[in-house]
């Protein structure tokens, strides 16, 4: 999916006003600086490029973080101020609801919504570029 | 200290697909970063190709996206280019290295491919 | 495409001398740049990260400056291992990340 023609200044205001506090939720407990934010991105389409792969694909060690407030929120944000984001999405819900049916909180997963935060961070920078 | 290693075959002819590997010691390319790769025309300067991140995320230069994949093995901590249809301007030194998908902070010692007959 | 241009192409100096080479964007990228260092048969490698941060065990006597669409890389005090080809890369400018034509510092 091509993120260009987002509305960027709607999923920011979500991202501040909910998204970030289930962030902070989900890592609670844990010190901000356990994990070292090994990617970054360049631009808010970018930015959210890499915050639906990360947030949606399962990794080693972390299955999913799909069923998780955030990332339920994150998926919202998209399909309301992404055009053509919730058609694009259908075969990949499907994926999600087979790979997990409960949630495992892993250092794994934390580390993870650890990089997840510093993405959103840098979606959220005054001067990053629009595309 | 994360080490990586490009190779494959110095000599490709036009039309084919060059294919190269890069096998990474020292860091789980499934742990963190993305895992690039760039190219060096002789004695001229730097293009990047694309990335695959720890997570799976793929990008690709525009100019270049319609010939590239780039894909992973996990098992053997190591990532993959393919270029297809190659010409001669396609000869150069091939680099792999780790990204925060933004610079490039460990490289490879490049290994160079000709496309000729 | 951002394209960079640095200068100069060529900058010829003496052990000891300062190298101030520039590289300039066809469009603001904020502080979104890097500068490389290549030697002869060898890899890049990285120095200067956000336009003016030094990446892990790059020495002093380098550092970066700039924003928007002019940048500086300075060598404070050449040493001989110094003398090399340089690039800037900006990553403003995603998926089309460009890299300059290069500047070559060498010996006089």
């Known amino acids: 999916y091509d993120f260009t023609n987002c509305d960027f200044e709607k999923i920011k205001a979500a991202y501040l006003s909910t998204i970030s506090k289930d962030l902070i939720t989900y890592m609670s407990g844990t010190k901000s600086t356990e994990f070292n934010n090994t990617v970054s991105c360049s631009n808010r389409p970018h930015c959210l490029t890499e915050i639906q792969s990360l947030t949606f694909n399962p990794t080693a060690g972390c299955a999913s973080l799909a069923k998780e407030m955030f990332a339920m929120k994150t998926k919202a944000a998209l399909a309301i101020w992404c055009p053509g984001y919730s058609e694009t999405q259908i075969n990949a819900t499907q994926a999600m609801k087979k790979a997990r049916k409960s949630k495992v909180t892993t250092n794994k997963c934390l580390e993870q919504v650890s990089q997840l935060q510093g993405l959103w961070r840098r979606f959220n920078r005054p001067l990053l570029k629009q595309q | 200290q994360v080490q990586l290693q490009e190779s494959g075959p110095g000599l490709v002819k036009p039309s084919e697909t060059l294919s190269l590997t890069c096998t990474v010691s020292g860091y789980s390319i499934s742990s963190g970063y993305g895992w690039s790769w760039i190219r060096q025309p002789p004695g001229k300067g730097l293009e990047w190709i694309g990335y695959i991140s720890y997570y799976g995320s793929i990008s690709y230069n525009p100019s270049l996206k319609s010939r590239v994949t780039i894909s992973r093995d996990t098992s053997k901590n190591q990532f993959s280019l393919k270029l297809s249809s190659v010409t001669a301007a396609d000869t150069a030194v091939y680099y792999c290295a780790r990204t925060n998908l933004l610079y490039f902070d460990s490289w490879g010692q490049g290994t160079l491919v000709t496309v000729s007959s | 495409e951002i394209v960079l241009t640095q200068s100069p192409a060529t900058l010829s100096l003496s052990p000891g001398e300062r190298a101030t080479l520039s590289c300039r964007a066809s469009?603001?990228?904020?502080?979104?740049l890097a500068w490389y260092q290549q030697k002869p048969g060898q890899a890049p490698r990285l120095l200067i990260y956000d336009a003016s941060s030094r990446a892990t065990g790059i020495p002093a006597r380098f550092s970066g400056s700039g924003s928007g669409t002019d940048f500086t890389l300075t060598i404070s005090s050449l040493e001989p291992e110094d003398f090399a080809v340089y690039y800037c890369?900006?990553?403003?400018?995603?998926?089309?990340?460009?890299f300059g034509q290069g500047t070559k510092v060498e010996i006089k």
């Open positions: 890369q900006q990553y403003s400018d995603w998926p089309q990340y460009t």
């Open positions: 469009q603001s990228v904020s502080n979104n």
